[in-house]
């Protein structure tokens, strides 16, 4: 007997489609061997149709796929569009040769069924509105009309044109007559339920005369549509309920033995388990909805449903859509730290993973909102301008061909505290979601930044200088400026680097900038921070006021600017990867017309597309040491 | 909630042929999957036979043990469910479990993926 199970017998109908799972024993051999589905020929050979190895026979080009689940120790075959030649036998078997392992399945595809002349049928699905017409002769125009439901051999009346209606029908069922219509008359019944599938009867008149027609309702649960989705990637579950609920809340469920719970719905009810890597959008106006999962664990495996009603919870009679998601664990989506700690006023830099072969895709940021249905406003992106509030702490580093962009984010409130999405233009499974966790500050920052007030006088020589402990005595230090589209790094000069590190004196471990000579373009935020190779580590910010020789009235109050990065811990900000703009005296003259476009253009990421990367900064106005 | 009764069950002799029903109340189903399980004193349920109805398709599994001999079957999604057992053995004596899971999920030999059990139906085959 063979160790492979799996159904010995599947049977369906033409156009449809089966879904054939094959169970193996837990091995780690099992597991990472090819798994194959093949037809059994009359000459004893087994044809492969469909392998793990990729191989797809042409028969099954466009309608199949064969899936592995090694956490399950399962594989599946899905086969679409089928046809009555599919009925044979078959074998879903793992090894190298369609020899090995394997399991007997036979597969039989049937025509759709016919029935007898004189019965209509109706095909509706769950929740929907059926109208059955029932035609009469013209002696029989005056005469009672009703719809019954055949139980064994009985018939019970569900309408009648005496205002009768069977309580199980109550405000569903109603009989009608259209315009001037004198042979035919109609049963509508609404929001139908899996009881009322069954044979129906129609009749208007008594006795022998009476003019009878048959209905054969079939009222389908959805069949579920199958999705297959990697560990840590997304999912987007479409949902569309037709115009009729476009005015009742939505909500997506998922199935638990008798119950469905809900995970969201338009009425801000939210399963905590989603809380911060979930949105419902609305689509239009006719209904349409979409709910959007991000970092897509294990236990997310399931059967989910979407339905409208006023409530937001499921109610039977209301139409649905349902889905099966699987997850494999077999992700190509590495695993990145799904929790985030800083402290106030200091910084974070978090590390996005994005589709290696996408480098060129835009990268954005957003913020998850718990408002309403979750929203994630983009806070920075490759091509969008940071977003008020963010200004001088908040900056995306790319590291093309990486795989990965970094964001850094400093002067950290708690405020900073919630949920943040990594994410691109390209590939859309690749959604990461971080949590960002602020705690009060119980000691001094790692970088200290002096002077604290920070004033430059124009046409003069100004230092500033970031003092770091030993612990970061090997790593690379930096100055950089911010700007809205990045933090350039800037020439700066270590003056902790001539120690020995042997003798690391805590209080003479510097690095310094210099602008001379000052020019009005240099007042800003400047970023001193510390990383190895692309690894970016902790930061600190400062805004430098650049006031005239002559007058005495600074530009920007700089202890007001500097108060926000130093002196108020609940307004700091986090460790941020940041771009640089216009600061610059000489850049190419080029980038200065992308730079314009990118303060003209929107606040929205996809509306963001100005090309301008202003590069290295050895431009900075004046020369640093 | 969903009731399941069988019935069916008696006494017989080697060689000899029974016809299990599993009767479904409550809740009517489309992506259902129906089984059967028996179990001898002292010992673990062991997984017997199991159809599954996907709209408009099914799917049927049994044990090797019974292969050939015992067919489950299932007249439509709301309908009765029913386990003809041909060429009985005494080691087929034990007490017949009907037992169902909506929607299909799991294993279909592992009695811990279903969520609705009937109360059992003893059936004796002597020799």
């Known amino acids: 007997q063979s160790p492979i199970f799996g159904p010995q017998d599947v049977s369906s109908i033409e156009g449809n489609s089966v879904s054939i799972t094959c169970y193996y024993p837990d091995t780690s051999v099992n597991r990472h061997t090819r798994k194959y589905w093949c037809r059994q020929g009359a000459n004893g050979y087994c044809a492969t149709l469909i392998s793990s190895n990729g191989y797809l026979s042409k028969e099954y080009s466009g309608r199949a796929s064969l899936i592995n689940f090694p956490e399950n120790s399962t594989f599946v075959i899905n086969i679409a569009h089928l046809t009555q030649e599919d009925t044979g036998s078959y074998k879903c078997g793992l090894g190298t040769t369609n020899r090995g392992l394997f399991f007997d399945v036979s597969l039989e595809v049937s025509q759709v069924p016919e029935f007898p002349n004189d019965t209509h049928v109706y095909t509706k699905d769950i929740g929907r509105t059926v109208t059955i017409e029932c035609r009469f002769k013209e002696g029989n125009a005056h005469s009672k009309k009703s719809l019954c439901k055949k139980r064994g051999e009985a018939c019970e009346v569900v309408i009648d044109s005496t205002e009768y209606v069977d309580p199980s029908y109550k405000d569903r069922a109603i009989l009608f007559m259209k315009g001037t219509s004198r042979d035919i008359f109609y049963v509508n019944i609404s929001h139908l339920i899996p009881s009322d599938a069954g044979l129906y009867v129609c009749q208007a008149g008594e006795g022998p005369s009476a003019d009878k027609n048959n209905a054969d309702l079939q009222v389908l649960e959805p069949e579920p549509e199958l999705l297959y989705k990697d560990l840590r990637s997304s999912v987007t579950f479409e949902c569309d309920l037709g115009r009729e609920v476009a005015n009742d809340a939505k909500y997506l469920c998922r199935k638990n033995k008798e119950t469905c719970d809900v995970i969201i719905n338009t009425l801000g009810k939210r399963d905590p388990a989603f809380e911060g890597r979930i949105l419902l959008t609305p689509r239009d106006d006719n209904g349409r909805f979409s709910v959007l999962i991000t970092g897509l664990r294990k236990e997310d495996a399931g059967h989910y449903q979407c339905g409208a009603h006023s409530s937001g919870l499921p109610q039977e009679g209301w139409p649905v859509q349902a889905w099966q998601l699987f997850v494999n664990e077999e992700s190509t989506i590495p695993n990145s730290r799904s929790v985030v700690k800083g402290v106030t006023g200091g910084s974070v830099a978090i590390v996005c993973p994005y589709n290696p072969k996408e480098s060129s895709s835009l990268k954005y940021w957003c913020h998850w909102e718990a408002d309403e249905n979750g929203r994630c406003p983009v806070l920075v992106g490759t091509q969008a301008l940071v977003q008020e509030g963010y200004e001088g702490r908040l900056a995306l580093f790319d590291q093309p061909g990486s795989g990965a962009y970094t964001v850094i984010l400093n002067q950290l409130t708690t405020q900073d505290s919630g949920f943040y999405w990594c994410l691109t233009d390209g590939d859309s499974r690749w959604r990461t979601t971080i949590e960002l966790q602020v705690a009060e500050a119980t000691k001094k920052p790692d970088l200290e930044v002096t002077p604290q007030n920070a004033t430059a006088v124009i046409g003069e020589t100004f230092t500033i200088s970031c003092h770091y402990p030993c612990k970061f005595y090997s790593q690379e230090k930096y100055w950089c400026k911010w700007s809205n589209d990045g933090c350039h790094i800037l020439p700066s000069h270590d003056e902790g680097a001539r120690q020995s590190s042997v003798s690391c004196d805590q209080s003479s471990q510097i690095v310094s900038m210099t602008l001379n000579p000052v020019k009005k373009e240099d007042e800003g935020w400047y970023w001193c921070g510390v990383k190895e190779g692309q690894v970016y580590g902790e930061t600190t910010a400062i805004y430098v006021a650049v006031e005239e020789r002559t007058r005495g009235s600074p530009h920007i109050n700089p202890t007001d600017a500097n108060a926000r990065a130093k002196d108020a811990p609940e307004e700091e900000a986090m460790e941020s990867s940041v771009r640089e703009d216009e600061n610059k005296a000489n850049l190419d003259p080029r980038l200065f017309a992308d730079e314009r476009e990118i303060q003209n253009a929107g606040d929205q990421a996809q509306e963001n597309r100005a090309s301008g990367n202003a590069g290295s900064a050895g431009g900075q106005s004046g020369s640093s040491k | 909630e969903v009731q399941l009764v069988e019935s069916g069950g008696g006494l017989v002799q080697t060689g000899e042929s029974l016809r299990l029903s599993c009767a479904a109340s409550g809740r009517a189903f489309s992506d259902l999957r129906m089984a059967w399980f028996r179990q001898v004193p002292g010992k673990e349920r062991e997984f017997v036979a199991a159809?599954?109805?996907?709209?408009?398709?099914?799917?049927?599994y049994s044990a090797d043990s019974v292969k050939g001999r015992f067919t489950i079957s299932r007249t439509s999604p709301k309908g009765e469910t029913y386990l003809q057992m041909n060429g009985l053995k005494p080691e087929d004596t034990a007490v017949y479990y009907c037992a169902a899971v909506s929607p299909v999920v799991g294993d279909p030999r592992n009695s811990d993926t279903y969520n609705y059990w009937g109360q059992g139906t003893q059936v004796t085959v002597s020799s």
């Open positions: 159809v599954e109805w996907r709209g408009s398709s099914r799917y049927y």
